[in-house]
C-alpha cells in the first residue's frame, strides 16, 4: 500500500491533519483524517495544481485538472482529478472526513502526491451553479487552509 | 451577452400538452446545469426542473413528477419541457434559467394558461 | 422540505435609505443561499450566490451575509432603480426553493 499525509495551515485558526492510502496502484484511495476551526456547514475539499505554498494558498494554483475537465462533483464524471468534494464541518468547528475516491491515486497520470490539498471558505456548488466560474472553483470561496500531499512511511 | 429565449406557452384545456424551448446563446451551452422556473400570476417563484449538461440526469419538483419532462439537445443550444396532463394550477409564466440548484441568467419567460 | 421565511414582505422606504431583508430556514443550509431581484413584468435577476458572492455587474451597495438559518440581503443606499421584489432562494436541499418575496416600494 502507498500511503500519504497532509498537514493543512491557514492564516487562521483552521488547521488539520489528512491522511491518504491506496492498497494497489489503480484502486480507490482512502482519505480520512479532522480539520478544526472552521465555520458550522459545508466546505469545499480540492486538490489544488501546485505543490507551492510560497505565498500561502494562493499560489497552490487552480485544481488539480490533468484531464481538461469542468469543474464538477465527486461522483461525477465531468469533473477536475482534485474535486473531492465538500467537508462538513458541526457545531464546533471540527469537520471528520472519511472518503474514498477512484478517480485520485498516489502514483500515475492521476497522482496526488507533492500537489497541495485545500479546504475552501464556502459550500462547493459542484458545477451546478449559474456562472462561469460554478465549473471552474465551485464558487467554494477563498482558501482557509492548506497543505502539501507528502508519501507517508 | 448571453441570451436565454423561451417560445412554445399559449392556451391549453386541463389535461392538454405544450411543450416549452429555450434557445441559448452566448455561452457555452454544453457545459451548464439548466432548469426551468415558473411563477403562477402575482405569486412567488419556484423551480420547476432541471438537467445536468450532458442530459444524463434530471430532477423534478413533486407537483410536476410524472408530468413534465425536461430535456437538451446540446446541438442545437436548446432547453425544452415537456408538459403533460396540464392542471390549472400550472398557469405560470416559465422561464429557463442558467444553472442546476442556483441561477445565473434568465430568460424572458413564456406565459402558459391551463383553463378551460 | 426547506421552509424559508422572507421578511418582511413589504417594505416601504425613501432613496438614500439602508434597507435589510431577512430570510430564515428551517434548518441549516451551509452557504447554499442565492438573492434575486424582480422588477415587474421582468425576470428575476441575480445579485448574489453562495450568501455573500456580489453577481458580476451587480453594484456594491448590495451585500449579502448570514450563516445556518438567518440570512440578511442589504442595500447600503437605495437607488430608484433598486425599488423592486427581492426573493433569497436555498439550493442546498432538494427541491430547491424561494421564500415567499419581499416588495420593496418607494415611501
Known amino acids: 500500500a502507498t500511503k500519504a499525509v497532509c498537514v493543512l495551515k491557514g492564516d487562521g485558526p483552521v488547521q488539520g491533519i489528512i491522511n491518504f492510502e491506496q492498497k494497489e496502484s489503480n484502486g480507490p484511495v482512502k482519505v480520512w483524517g479532522s480539520i478544526k476551526g472552521l465555520t458550522e456547514g459545508l466546505h469545499g475539499f480540492h486538490v489544488h495544481e501546485f505543490g507551492d505554498n510560497t505565498a500561502g494558498c494562493t499560489s497552490a494554483g487552480p485544481h488539480f485538472n490533468p484531464l481538461s475537465r469542468k469543474h464538477g462533483g465527486p461522483k461525477d464524471e465531468e469533473r477536475h482529478v482534485g474535486d473531492l468534494r465538500n467537508v462538513t464541518a458541526d457545531k464546533d468547528g471540527v469537520a471528520d472526513v472519511s472518503i474514498e475516491d477512484s478517480v485520485i491515486s498516489l502514483s500515475g497520470d492521476h497522482c496526488i502526491i507533492g500537489r497541495t490539498l485545500v479546504v475552501h471558505e464556502k459550500a462547493d456548488d459542484l458545477g451546478k451553479g449559474g456562472n462561469e466560474e460554478s465549473t471552474k472553483t465551485g464558487n467554494a470561496g477563498s482558501r482557509l487552509a492548506c497543505g502539501v500531499i507528502g508519501i507517508a512511511q | 451577452e448571453v441570451q436565454l429565449v423561451e417560445s412554445g406557452g399559449g392556451l391549453v384545456q386541463p389535461g392538454g400538452s405544450l411543450r416549452l424551448s429555450c434557445a441559448a446563446s452566448g455561452f457555452t451551452f454544453s457545459s451548464f446545469w439548466m432548469s426551468w422556473v415558473r411563477q403562477a400570476p402575482g405569486k412567488g417563484l419556484e423551480w420547476v426542473a432541471n438537467?445536468?449538461?450532458?442530459?444524463?440526469?434530471?430532477d423534478y419538483v413533486d407537483s410536476v413528477k410524472g408530468r413534465f419532462t425536461i430535456s437538451r439537445d446540446n446541438a442545437k443550444n436548446s432547453l425544452y419541457l415537456q408538459m403533460n396532463s396540464l392542471r390549472a394550477e400550472d398557469t405560470a409564466v416559465y422561464y429557463c434559467?442558467?444553472?442546476?440548484?442556483?441561477?445565473?441568467?434568465w430568460g424572458q419567460g413564456t406565459l402558459v394558461t391551463v383553463s378551460s | 422540505v426547506i421552509w424559508m421565511t422572507q421578511s418582511p414582505s413589504l417594505l416601504s422606504a425613501s432613496t438614500g435609505d439602508r434597507v435589510t431583508i431577512s430570510c430564515r430556514m428551517s434548518?441549516?443550509?451551509?452557504?447554499?443561499l442565492a438573492w434575486y431581484q424582480q422588477k415587474p413584468g421582468k425576470a428575476p435577476e441575480v445579485l448574489i450566490y453562495a450568501v455573500s458572492t456580489l453577481q458580476s455587474g451587480v453594484p456594491s451597495r448590495f451585500s449579502g451575509s448570514g450563516s445556518g438559518t438567518d440570512f440578511t440581503l442589504t442595500i447600503s443606499c437605495l437607488q430608484s432603480e433598486d425599488f423592486a421584489t427581492y426573493y433569497c432562494?436555498?439550493?442546498?436541499?432538494?427541491?430547491?426553493?424561494f421564500g415567499q418575496g419581499t416588495k420593496l416600494e418607494i415611501k
Open positions: 434548518q441549516g443550509i451551509s452557504s447554499y
Open positions: 432562494q436555498q439550493y442546498y436541499s432538494f427541491p430547491y426553493t
Open positions: 434559467a442558467r444553472g442546476g440548484i442556483w441561477f445565473g441568467p
Open positions: 438537467i445536468k449538461h450532458d442530459g444524463s440526469e434530471q
